[in-house]
Interface confidence: low
């Protein structure tokens, strides 16, 4: 049978050679992360303004407040991504106006709108994970035929103490998957 | 910057319940997780379990069906609440902020309460 | 549950040399997003712990450029470049990758 390279899992998008997982539940900031975790993935940390345009355009489209991986919980102020790199000035242009403000201690960005926000990061929100996607010269198992593949299941023993937690969530994320053949 | 207080009674009656609480000052408590710990005299750390708001936990099995955690927003306190307590749960308890997965660590630790059980 | 076995669990040392502690793990704290999920706690006589090293290899704030931590997968050290006075108490390694959390027994640094 004919071999197609599908270099992101079933469900996950692909753009400019990452993979993207927009979120069909809710969780706060930090479940948020360990859901991406979960799944050898990273709460979403945007590299260029190409792909933070193609993110906007997605959260936007969906209507929905989208948490990304950046806050500023480690010093107030300071904004921080998840990988440890410090928001450049040149995305500073994407705050929506007047934001960030941190009124009522908002330490984690969420896309909003048109912009990003801050809000407060005990809420449940979408988010997006982002992972890099499957080189097309080796034989993965992102090579499908003639059905796609379930996601990529989590790494054994990961999750940063919320195993318990996300098996729901897992759970959910392959249900989903079989619904949709 | 953030502090930690713990607070409740020095003494439990075998069988009765452990109730402690944390104060969180100098910052909001929604934006982290929340840990206990606790250590016998001369021993080492034991981890109880953290939580996150009241509906986002993560306990010790080995106290799993005895522990409760709670956050009360409103008072930026969480509490501790252990159950069926007997002289093996007589330790220094510790309160701490759990920086996440992302941060990582626990910092800054309350300086302790201890807790003694017996009759 | 991951079972962490600290070594040595007594370690004698002379002021402004150094000290070396040994952590592992029984199964992997490096996590496919390159972290390990492994941390380090001083705790002086009478006092709270206090976190000196976070996932693997960070210094947390305020903690001396003499401490340092390394490794990857199981095995990880805390170094000591020269070890002061005020670096007496025991030392703890954890392992955050998942629940239960788990502690090391601790090694007991005190000065000859």
């Known amino acids: 049978t004919e071999r197609l390279c599908h270099p992101c899992p079933w469900e996950w998008t692909f753009f400019q050679g990452n993979c993207y997982f927009m979120s069909n539940s809710q969780r706060n900031w930090h479940d948020s992360i360990t859901a991406c975790k979960e799944v050898g993935a990273q709460l979403v940390v945007i590299k260029s303004a190409e792909e933070q345009n193609f993110l906007q355009l997605q959260s936007s489209r969906s209507n929905r407040f989208t948490w990304m991986g950046l806050s500023d919980l480690n010093q107030e102020g300071t904004w921080q991504w998840v990988d440890g790199s410090p928001l450049l000035p040149s995305f500073k242009q994407y705050w929506n106006r007047g934001e960030p403000n941190n009124v009522g201690e908002e330490d984690c960005a969420e896309f909003s709108g048109n912009g990003w926000n801050d809000d407060k990061c005990n809420l449940a929100k979408f988010w997006i994970c982002k992972k890099s996607a499957a080189s097309c010269s080796r034989d993965e198992e992102q090579f499908l035929s003639p059905a796609p593949a379930t996601p990529n299941p989590p790494p054994a023993g990961s999750g940063g103490g919320l195993n318990d937690i996300f098996e729901a969530q897992k759970i959910e994320w392959h249900e989903h998957h079989h619904h949709h053949h | 910057q953030v502090q930690l207080q713990e607070s409740g009674p020095g003494l439990v009656k075998p069988s009765e319940t452990l109730s402690l609480t944390c104060t969180v000052s100098g910052g909001s408590i929604s934006s982290y997780y929340w840990t206990w710990i606790r250590q016998p005299a001369g021993k080492g750390l034991e981890w109880i379990g953290r939580v996150f708001t009241s509906e986002s936990t993560n306990y010790n099995p080995s106290l799993k069906n005895r522990v409760t955690m709670s956050v009360d927003t409103s008072k930026n306190q969480f509490s501790l609440r252990l159950n069926s307590v007997t002289a093996a749960d007589t330790a220094m308890y510790y309160c701490a902020r759990d920086r996440g997965t992302y941060l990582g660590g626990f910092d800054p630790w309350g300086q302790g309460t201890l807790v003694t059980v017996s009759s | 549950d991951i079972v962490m076995t600290q070594s040595p669990l007594s370690l004698p040392v002379t002021p402004g040399e150094p000290a070396s502690i040994s952590c592992r793990s029984s199964?992997?704290?490096?996590?496919?997003?390159?972290?390990?999920?492994l941390d380090w706690y001083l705790q002086k006589p009478g006092q709270s712990p206090q976190l000196l090293i976070y996932l693997g290899s960070n210094r947390a704030s305020g903690v001396p450029d003499r401490f340092s931590g390394s490794g990857s997968g199981t095995d990880f050290t805390l170094k000591i470049s020269r070890v002061e006075a005020e670096d007496v108490g025991v030392y703890y390694c954890?392992?955050?990758?998942?629940?239960?959390?788990?502690f090391g027994q601790g090694t007991k640094l005190e000065i000859k």
């Open positions: 199964q992997s704290l490096l996590h496919s997003n390159g972290y390990n999920y």
């Open positions: 954890i392992q955050a990758l998942q629940t239960p959390f788990t």
